[in-house]
């Protein structure tokens, strides 16, 4: 219908040549390609003040191709879009814009956040943690016998790490002091003789439950192991002994 009329007019034009190059079906010296060979797309390129017709096998970046009965035409995507299927659906936005539902936005809508790698608006993902595990057995130095005071621990897993704007992860482990079951260690389990007898009774503060604090994104929080607690107590004992010695030597020196 319109196609044949357009072709007839072109053929009668004095500058129209049939001996064209680069995929043109018809062309002119001044305007380049006027129509294309089958399946090729027609696009107008601006060169200075002139618009030159070019025939391409696929449309350039920022354009999409539509096949009409009379012409296969490259049409510009929207200004903020780099690659599109058609005017409604952008598939890649220009720099500084985020893709959301086929549109390019300079900032993401409420409830969504920008992914700066894919340059898309994505749902905010909050941290998800599993239920706590049961408390571990009450232990001291890896043993469940021979001591009054030990520690027990429980843990949980991070099931879903949060996105940039998501809620932070809670602690992934908790430790608290506990009373070890009163039973003698078998020979293989025994610790250093008499150490436990010398130990002072638990302070009220020491009996309190201790909870580890979380880091910002739910990485395993640091907790005091039974070994570390044992070392601390040993150091405190040594300090007390040193203090006692000092007091003795001071009193002696004053006699002289």
């Amino acid at each position: 219908q319109n196609a044949s009329r357009g072709r007839r007019q072109r053929r009668m034009h004095p500058n129209v040549s049939q001996g064209c190059q680069g995929g043109c079906a018809t062309c002119s010296d001044y305007n380049g390609c006027l129509s294309c060979k089958p399946r090729l797309f027609f696009v107008l390129e601006r060169i200075g003040m002139k618009q030159i017709g070019v025939c391409l096998s696929s449309c350039p970046s920022g354009y999409y191709g539509t096949r009409y009965p009379d012409i296969n035409k490259c049409t510009k995507c929207k200004v903020d879009c780099d690659t599109c299927f058609n005017k409604n659906f952008c598939t890649k936005c220009k720099s500084g814009f985020y893709l959301h539902l086929g549109k390019c936005l300079d900032s993401c809508p409420e409830g969504l956040e920008a992914n700066n790698h894919t340059m898309e608006c994505v749902s905010i993902v909050h941290c998800e943690a599993s239920e706590w595990s049961p408390w571990s057995p009450c232990m001291k130095k890896g043993k469940t016998c021979g001591f009054k005071r030990g520690t027990e621990t429980r843990v949980r897993d991070i099931l879903q790490h949060p996105s940039a704007k998501g809620n932070l992860c809670p602690p992934t482990s908790e430790t608290r002091t506990c009373i070890v079951q009163r039973k003698k260690c078998s020979k293989g389990e025994r610790g250093k003789k008499g150490r436990e007898r010398k130990r002072k009774k638990l302070n009220k503060e020491e009996r309190k439950e201790t909870s580890s604090s979380s880091d910002s994104k739910g990485l395993e929080s640091s907790i005091e192991t039974p070994d570390q607690q044992e070392n601390k107590e040993r150091q405190q004992q040594q300090k007390r002994r040193a203090r006692d010695k000092q007091q003795k030597s001071v009193s002696v020196s004053t006699v002289h």
Epitope: T66, Y68, F85, N86, N88
Partner: antibody, heavy 116, light 107 residues
């Protein structure tokens, strides 16, 4: 939000005329090629006609060529389908849609019944 | 005109089933194929374009594949809201044509 609302359908005798309208809102109407697609009762979808964004070119399916005319008024954001010499086989729900390779947005349709 | 033939014309399935609908073109249409879903009394809704590109908001259980003349729409695990009629459409050539449709019913 894109909205397309068709009107003008009804019951008409064979050989008579009918004019369908489609009011568009929620998008830049003058940027988009528009089409009419119809669906006979209990049948599939059939493209009828397309008009390009500026109204300068129109395309029709063979069975309606010379009888139907698609037009648009970009100042009123409205698409039209003038249907002359209607036949029983033109009985269908007529949808207007944006046509950019695919038919992305559709109206709710208007029923045209051609019957004596 | 390019003919699109869908098979089957109708299909009974249950919730949770994996379903495949095929669309065969009478000539090479490259990857210029779309799929639509239509529910009774409603306008069709575009699901997929360029054979396998999902429209935003369409669940990922829908997928498309194929090229040239043979194409498929797959629903990996049917949900109650998926029971509808599905159409393929080619836009490689005018007139743009649709398949005759595949009606997906509850078994």
């Amino acid at each position: 939000e894109v909205q397309l609302v068709e009107s003008g359908g009804g019951v008409v005798q064979p050989g008579r005329s009918l004019r369908l309208s489609c009011a568009a809102s929620g998008f830049t109407f003058s940027d988009y090629d528009m089409a009419w697609v119809r669906q006979a009762p209990g049948k599939g979808l059939e493209w009828v006609a397309t008009i390009i964004y500026d109204g300068s070119r129109t395309y029709y399916r063979d069975s309606v060529k010379g009888r139907f005319t698609i037009s648009r008024d970009n100042s009123k954001n409205t698409l039209y389908l003038q249907m002359n010499s209607l036949r029983a086989e033109d009985t269908a729900v007529y949808y207007c849609a944006t046509h950019d390779k695919t038919f992305d947005y559709w109206g709710q349709g208007t029923m045209v019944t051609v019957s004596s | 005109d390019i003919q699109l033939t869908q098979s089957p014309s109708s299909l009974s399935a249950s919730v949770g089933d994996r379903v495949t609908i095929t669309c065969r073109a009478s000539e090479d249409i490259y990857s210029d194929l779309a799929w639509y879903q239509q529910k009774p009394g409603k306008a069709p809704k575009l699901l997929i374009y360029d054979v396998n590109s999902l429209i935003h908001g369409v669940p990922s259980r829908f997928s498309g594949s194929g090229s040239g003349t043979d194409f498929t729409l797959t629903i990996s695990s049917l949900q109650p809201e998926d029971f509808a009629t599905y159409y393929c459409q080619q836009y490689d050539n005018y007139p743009n044509t649709f398949g005759q449709g595949t009606k997906l019913e509850i078994k």
